[in-house]
Amino acid sequence: QPDAINAAVTCCYNFTNRKISVQRLASYRRITSSKCPKEAVIFKTIVAKEICADPKQKWVQDSMDHLDKQIQTPKP
């Protein structure tokens, strides 16, 4: 779970050790603040749960790519 250290900054202190299916993912945001101990990705699932993930892991990069493409492709 991400932790809010103040109103403006949310940090991840631990990463999920399970790969999440892209079908369960709704969106993501990047955590790059130098106030945080680690750079991270926070995935939001389709049931609005937020999950911290390690952006160095290939599945995380692939999931970000998938979501980016989904956002850019107009729905029929």
Epitope: R30, T32, S34, P37, K38, E39, P55, K56, D65, D68, K69, I71, Q72
Partner: antibody
């Protein structure tokens, strides 16, 4: 506060090698990627490659593949870039930068490398 | 490599002007682009990354827009400290590539 401090200016002969260091403070380098970007005099920015200090995996622009070596020492929070077979076109300011997403949030102050006979 | 074409290469403007710099990628980069500001003798400074993420401490007069292959950096009201060179960069796929830069000069 994140700081990246690079080694000093170098003057090198064509055909030789140069090794530039980048010491990080205010962050654990194993939690990010360390990149190297160069800028020739009056020119634009050129990404050379990066390292994951956690596992020493590297990725390079094919243009530099075989001529550049990027290493990192997590015990001293220092990244290194070595460029071999130097030619005059390698005269540039070399920057280290950090970021896992492919953009660069913090930069070193730059190291000027001059290649001249 | 994904080529990034930036225009104009230079422009002259006055304090208070609205300034627009454009960047065209040779393929879709899905909003994975960043904008940097560089002053002479200094390292580049990150301004914007991704769709519209303004870097912490960057004034709100800077904004980014665009999608697909076409992206824009806008400075809504140019300030004296904004005279510099600006670069776009794509981080959709390695090797990460930069535009050629836009030098913003005082008119």
């Amino acid at each position: 506060q994140v700081q990246l401090v690079q080694s000093g200016a170098e003057v090198k002969k064509p055909g030789s090698s140069v090794k530039v260091s980048c010491k990080a403070s205010g962050l654990t380098i194993s939690h990010t990627y360390m990149h190297w970007v160069r800028q020739a005099p009056g020119q634009g920015l050129e990404w050379m490659g990066r390292i994951d200090p956690d596992n020493h995996n590297t990725k390079f622009d094919p243009k530099f593949q075989g001529r550049v070596t990027i290493t990192a020492d997590t015990s001293t929070s220092t990244a290194y870039m070595e460029l071999s077979s130097l030619r005059s076109e390698d005269t540039a300011v070399y920057y280290c930068a950090r970021g896992v997403f492919g953009f660069f949030e913090h930069w070193g102050q730059g190291t000027t490398v001059t290649v001249s006979s | 490599d994904i080529q990034m074409t930036q225009s104009p290469s230079s422009l002259s403007a006055s304090v208070g002007d609205r300034v627009t710099i454009t960047c065209k990628a040779f393929e879709d980069i899905y909003n994975r682009r960043a904008w940097y500001q560089q002053k002479p003798g200094k390292a580049p400074k990150l301004l914007i990354h991704g769709a519209t993420s303004l870097e912490h401490g960057v004034p709100s007069r800077f904004s980014g827009s665009g999608s697909g292959t076409d992206y824009t950096l806008t400075i809504s009201s140019l300030q004296p400290e904004d005279f510099a060179t600006y670069y776009c960069q794509q981080f959709w796929s390695a090797p990460y590539t930069f535009g050629g830069g836009t030098k913003v000069e005082i008119k």
